[in-house]
């Protein structure tokens, strides 16, 4: 494939990455799949600077990111190491709360209204953010 040198239409470029901000809601797994079909992934927050950028664009709205602990350890969807990476949890979070009455705990992370992170039931239909790196090989064949 060819290297992507600029962002697709309706995506926002920032620090050599492209971001797409949804305006509708999906369950975490559906949002994850949506991003993958766009040759991207749910946003992976690696710095305070990136956190502020995303926060500015999403506003005070619950929004999925690419972080989950559905198989035990917290994992970023692109393989970025959770343990050594940037974290911005709300105080007392993550708490794997069971009191929602929906069954099971809380396995998926989202931005809350103040931008800090919370774990929640993955089935909730929140907005989401896709991210793709500019310099990575595109899946599309090069133009002849």
């Amino acid at each position: 494939g060819s290297e992507r040198t600029c962002c697709p239409v309706n995506w926002v470029e920032h620090e050599r990455s492209c971001y797409w901000f949804s305006r509708s809601g999906k369950a975490w797994a559906d949002a994850d799949n949506y991003c993958r079909l766009e040759d991207a992934h749910l946003v992976v927050v690696t710095s305070w600077e990136e956190q502020k950028f995303v926060q500015h664009h999403i506003g005070p709205v619950n929004t999925w990111m690419g972080l989950h602990d559905q198989n035990g350890p917290w994992k970023w969807v692109d393989g970025t190491d959770y343990e050594t990476g940037f974290k911005n949890w709300r105080p007392e979070q993550p708490d794997d709360w069971y009191g929602h009455g929906l069954g099971g705990g809380e396995d998926c992370a989202h931005f809350t209204d103040d931008g800090r992170w919370n774990d929640d039931v993955c089935q909730r239909p929140y907005r989401w953010v896709c991210e793709t790196e500019l310099d990575k090989a595109s899946q599309e064949p090069p133009l002849l």
């Epitope: 917290w74 343990e83 974290k87 993550p94 794997d96 069971y98 069954g103 705990g105």
Partner: antibody
Framework: EVQLVESGGGLVKPGGSLRLSCAAS????????MNWVRQAPGKGLEWVSS????????YYPDSVKGRFTISRDNAKNSLYLQMNSLRAEDTAVYYC???????WGQGTLVTVSS | DIQMTQSPSYLSASVGDRVTITCRAS??????LGWYQQKPGKAPKRLIY???SLQSGVPSRFSGSGSGTEFTLTISSLQPEDFATYYC?????????FGGGTKVEIK
Amino acid sequence: EVQLVESGGGLVKPGGSLRLSCAASGFTFSSYTMNWVRQAPGKGLEWVSSISGSSSYLYYPDSVKGRFTISRDNAKNSLYLQMNSLRAEDTAVYYCARDRGSSWGQGTLVTVSS
Amino acid sequence: DIQMTQSPSYLSASVGDRVTITCRASQDIRDNLGWYQQKPGKAPKRLIYTAYSLQSGVPSRFSGSGSGTEFTLTISSLQPEDFATYYCLQHYNYPLTFGGGTKVEIK
């Protein structure tokens, strides 16, 4: 690498108390719910208690409620189980486990006998 | 409380056999179930999470299926190191509950 090491087990008389500890390493301790699970000699596994990452939520089965107290110290990466009013039926190997059992310690034996 | 009924309690099988263990929940727990293997004197080890997802590092001969109230752990071709006791665990709600266990022995 995730490591969980239990300690504090031993022989105690009925009605006595014991405090188990679990030292965790290799992961961001405060991000995870932690659990105690026990296994009586020759028997199956029994969940004993859970505590959320910041200690906001504590859970117990009826069999230990009011007698056992789970706690944690995130600054020390440590999980605890204070066991009071111990009974013979509390005799078991006690395991510390992370989240929903993706990682386990090696266990510590608690024997309640006169 | 949610009861987990596991069957059979004991199972005799030979190397190469296909082995199936079942757990039945007393109410719908969706896919909030894990399967664990335990060998004598050792801590349990998780094989399957969310009913059907294989834990990293676990051989592909292990598989999980089911949702709701009926769950199955299958070992497609039993190996010598698979002789152990297997447990299911529901984490749909507290109190968390284990199945009674299935001891897989050499025939």
